[in-house]
């Protein structure tokens, strides 16, 4: 008996071939001997089966001795043995219809779980193997679960159902809802304008929800809500914003915030949360602000940074085109009685400069100039 695997919702062609390459009488029945379809001369005739409106054949193939049964919009319950009667012989075809669906919406938040459920006909014992877009393989029976979805899990999951040495492939598009970056750091000199951007890692037709940026300044004992906003069909509207600092927010995606001035009291870490309509849980992106200030007071040239810096970052003071006078893994460095000239304060990571501030030291009889 020939076995054919089908997918729920798909169309399947069950073949039946006669030795004579011409149109002759044929008919298809199910295992209960109920006629599905056949021919009367060149006309297609249909029986009283439940497949009536979904069963078809191809007249053009009859002349070649092929008498297919085509079943559209397959259902699990279409799984059956179908019998083609032609030229006093019977051809049996066992059709097994499978369905694979995601337990919930196919748009899931980062960190959530994905469960894929296989619908299969009674008496079948299929195995399922799925391959994620990043090449991770998972195997299972009737259900497959993936916990802690990551951004790289977004895309087409390809699942293969195996039964009777035959296979049928399902493709399921999964969208992991997340920000492009889990965390970002902005390095700014004191007084500069700060731009925070929160690009999303997905695109959807309509995006509605609400969000908030909480800020923990390094100098503050507790965190504070800097801004709350609504998102409606990708349009951003500010609900509430603090007076200090007075943040500005872009009206369109990607989410974009502007801090007029980088000041030491603002240096710290923020957490932007976005709650999407009809989704449980929130999207998060951490943002960090590091602020640098270079000053000269009397005979002391000082460079300081505020905000979340890694212990391996190097803070240096050097006279332009010369070796660093001082270089430390600390948040403040200074030089006593600095020579006149253009001094550079550098924050660097393994030789890569992250932030730089220049200060001109004048001969001792005049006051310093900060460019």
């Amino acid at each position: 008996k020939k076995v054919v695997l089908g997918k729920k919702g798909d169309t399947v062609e069950l073949t039946c071939t006669a030795s004579q390459k011409k149109s002759i009488q044929f008919h298809w029945k199910n295992s209960n001997q109920i006629k599905i379809l056949g021919n009367q001369g060149s006309f297609l005739t249909k029986g009283p089966s439940k497949l009536n409106d979904r069963a078809d054949s191809r007249r053009s193939l009859w002349d070649q001795g092929n008498f297919p049964l085509i079943i559209k919009n397959l259902k699990i319950e279409d799984s059956d043995t179908y019998i083609c009667e032609v030229e006093d012989q019977k051809e049996e075809v066992q059709l097994l219809v499978f369905g694979l669906t995601a337990n919930s919406d196919t748009h899931l938040l980062q960190g959530q779980s994905l469960t894929l459920t296989l619908e299969s006909p009674p008496g079948s014992s299929p195995s399922v193997q799925c391959r994620s877009p990043r090449g991770k393989n998972i195997q299972g029976g009737k259900t497959l679960s993936v916990s802690q979805l990551e951004l790289q899990d977004s895309g087409t999951w390809t699942c293969t159902v195996l039964q009777n040495q035959k296979k049928v492939e399902f493709k399921i598009d999964i969208v992991v809802l997340a920000f492009q970056k889990a965390s970002s750091i902005v390095y700014k000199k004191e007084g500069e304008q700060v731009e925070f951007s929160f690009p999303l890692a997905f695109t959807v037709e309509k995006l509605t929800g609400s969000g908030e940026l909480w800020w923990q300044a390094e100098r503050a004992s507790s965190s504070k809500s800097w801004i709350t906003f609504d998102l409606k069909n990708k349009e951003v509207s500010v609900k509430r914003v603090t007076q200090d600092p007075k943040l500005q927010m872009g009206k369109k995606l990607p989410l974009h915030l502007t801090l007029p001035q980088a000041l030491p009291q603002y240096a710290g870490s923020g957490n932007l949360t976005l709650a999407l309509e009809a989704k449980t849980g929130k999207l998060h992106q951490e943002v960090n602000l590091v602020v640098m200030r270079a000053t000269q007071l009397q005979k002391n040239l000082t460079c300081e940074v505020w905000g979340p810096t890694s212990p391996k970052l190097m803070l240096s003071l050097k006279l332009e085109n010369k070796e660093a006078k001082v270089s430390k893994r600390e948040k403040a460095v200074w030089v006593l009685n600095p020579e006149a000239g253009m001094w550079q304060c550098l924050l660097s990571d393994s030789g890569q400069v992250l932030l730089e501030s220049n200060i001109k030291v004048l001969p001792t009889w005049s006051t310093p100039v900060q460019p």
Partner: antibody, heavy 115, light 107 residues
């Protein structure tokens, strides 16, 4: 809802090979046949040939010696190659889904053969 | 090959008119016939299949009849959007063949 999107070269010189591809989105590739049809002012609508998921093909005898239809089922795509083209092959070429009737069509591509 | 002949090749009519287009096959094709509508610069759209079955989404003013060699497409009350070219197609045997078309124009 099934959508068919087609692409390929629109201008050819005589004796070259016409090459077009059609991608099916939003429906079942299995169980159906996938056809190429052309339309020219002189000959009206002319069926070129078809292919199914298993790679079975049927061709119009008038073009059979020059036509190859192939399919990449992993991408739900099928292609047409027509060799040794002449000015008589200038037409709008359509891809379409068929069982007995052509129920979904591509947007069509005008292919001009000119020296 | 089965030849499909449509008549008339063009017809002028007014909104609200009843219009009939005929299609004749060079040999019997039972009811393996479809009708299509094509508007300028667009691909054809399936209207009627199996000689008389209305394709999903097609207005009920369109109807088809016939069997064997002679078939008709009837539009009971013409609407402005119905002015187009109509084709018949046989699915009885390879190669599939189409009629030469009937252009329906505004009177």
């Amino acid at each position: 809802q099934v959508q068919l999107q087609q692409w390929g070269a629109g201008l050819l010189k005589p004796s070259e090979t016409l090459s077009l591809t059609c991608a099916a989105y939003g429906g079942s590739f299995s169980g159906y046949y996938w056809s190429w049809i052309r339309q020219s002012p002189g000959k009206g609508l002319e069926w070129i040939g078809e292919i199914n998921q298993s790679g079975n093909t049927n061709y119009n005898p008038s073009l059979k010696s020059r036509v190859t239809i192939s399919a990449d089922t992993s991408k739900n795509q099928f292609s047409l190659k027509l060799s040794s083209v002449t000015a008589a092959d200038t037409a709008v070429y359509y891809c379409a889904r068929v069982l007995n009737w052509f129920d979904y069509w591509g947007q069509g591509i005008l292919v001009t053969v000119s020296s | 090959d089965i030849q499909m002949t449509q008549s008339p090749s063009s017809v002028s009519a007014s909104v609200g008119d009843r219009v009939t287009i005929t299609c004749r096959a060079s040999q019997g094709i039972s009811d393996w016939l479809a009708w299509y509508q094509q508007k300028s610069g667009k691909a054809p759209d399936l209207l009627i299949f199996a000689a008389s079955s209305l394709q999903s989404g097609v207005p009920s003013r369109f109807s088809g009849s016939g069997s064997g060699t002679d078939f008709t497409l009837t539009i009971s009350s013409l609407q402005p959007e119905d002015f187009a070219t109509y084709y018949c197609q046989q699915a009885n045997s390879f190669p599939y063949t189409f009629g030469q078309g009937t252009k329906l124009e505004i009177k």
